[in-house]
């Protein structure tokens, strides 16, 4: 008989190399039976995982599994780091393995403006 516990299928030592300035979707595969659990994303800061507020998320349903998606539109250099999804199910908190994003800043160092120039780019 198949278990009806919620399971989060992020592989151990999962990682993604991505480019800043382009969109990216970070997926948390969620297996559940009846009621879809409440799932959240957090970002690791040392040993603490800080809950991500004000971030766009969505669900993608497939036949045997669902995905809770964290949207990066676009990826920023600050998004570099490790993330974890967690599910609340029958008063239990289930945490996934962490997944790491390695963000490459596509704007080369030579193209990077100085602090004084940085704000001036915002002029039409």
């Amino acid at each position: 008989k198949e278990s009806c516990d919620v399971q989060l299928y992020i592989k151990e030592q999962s990682e993604h190399s991505i480019l800043a300035g382009d969109p990216f979707e970070l997926e948390c595969p969620v297996k559940y039976c009846a009621n879809r659990p409440h799932v959240t994303w957090c970002k690791l800061n040392g040993t603490t995982c800080v809950k991500l507020e004000d971030r766009q998320t969505s669900w993608k349903e497939e036949k045997n599994i669902s995905f809770f998606i964290l949207h990066f539109e676009p990826v920023l250099p600050n998004d570099n780091g490790s993330y974890r999804c967690s599910a609340n199910f029958q008063s239990n908190l289930i945490e996934s393995h962490s997944t790491t994003l390695y963000v490459t800043d596509v704007k080369s160092a030579s193209e990077r403006p100085s602090k004084d120039e940085m704000a001036s780019r915002f002029w039409a």
């Epitope: 800043a20 300035g21 382009d22 004000d54 676009p74 920023l76 704007k107 940085m118 002029w123």
Partner: antibody, heavy 120, light 106 residues
Framework: QVQLKESGPGLVAPSQSLSITCTVS????????VHWVRQSPGKGLEWLGV???????SYNPAPMSRLSISKDNSKSQVFLKMNSLQTDDTAMYYC??????????????WGQGTSVTVSS | QIVLSQSPAILSASPGEKVTMTCRAS?????MHWYQQKPGSSPKPWIY???NLASGVPARFSGSGSGTSYSLTISRMEAEDAATYYC?????????FGGGTKLEIK
Amino acid sequence: QVQLKESGPGLVAPSQSLSITCTVSGFSLTTYGVHWVRQSPGKGLEWLGVMWPGGRTSYNPAPMSRLSISKDNSKSQVFLKMNSLQTDDTAMYYCVRGDYEYDYYAMDYWGQGTSVTVSS
Amino acid sequence: QIVLSQSPAILSASPGEKVTMTCRASSSVSYMHWYQQKPGSSPKPWIYATSNLASGVPARFSGSGSGTSYSLTISRMEAEDAATYYCHQWSSNPYTFGGGTKLEIK
């Protein structure tokens, strides 16, 4: 010097389609995203969608079914196509460059806009 | 979608007067951008990421806020500040703008 310039038909008949070209200079479409924003008296500023540097697109869900954004990196051009125009699509259409900093994203350089009137 | 409500819609201020306009979001956003637009021109970035002034923007302008409430303040109104100011969020698609605050000089 960063510049974006829109070119459009000006007048479009109802139910017809709209095609606008945005020609950019001073930056590469493989490094920066280009957005389409329109401004109408009735709806104010409305973000329509973006062509990301890697070639993916994101759209405003409301007009999404009528919208298509594409680009030609070699010609430094981004294209907006909108089908089934109605009178409330009458607006000034802007293409706008998007840029990221360490922890935020913003639209920085705006084109001068192209005025589109939907009328028979 | 996140709705941005700007108030007041029209604001009239005398030279030298302190001016504050607000932008309220229907859901929490990470930061807010502000654009200035004058008749016949494209919008110009004015304040980005809540409180950073764009280059050339006078120091009498400031921005603040967090969560669902943001504001733009002018410490001393000047004639050249007369324009429409729009807030804009880049937290959730569709990326929305406020309806604008039209600032007039008395």
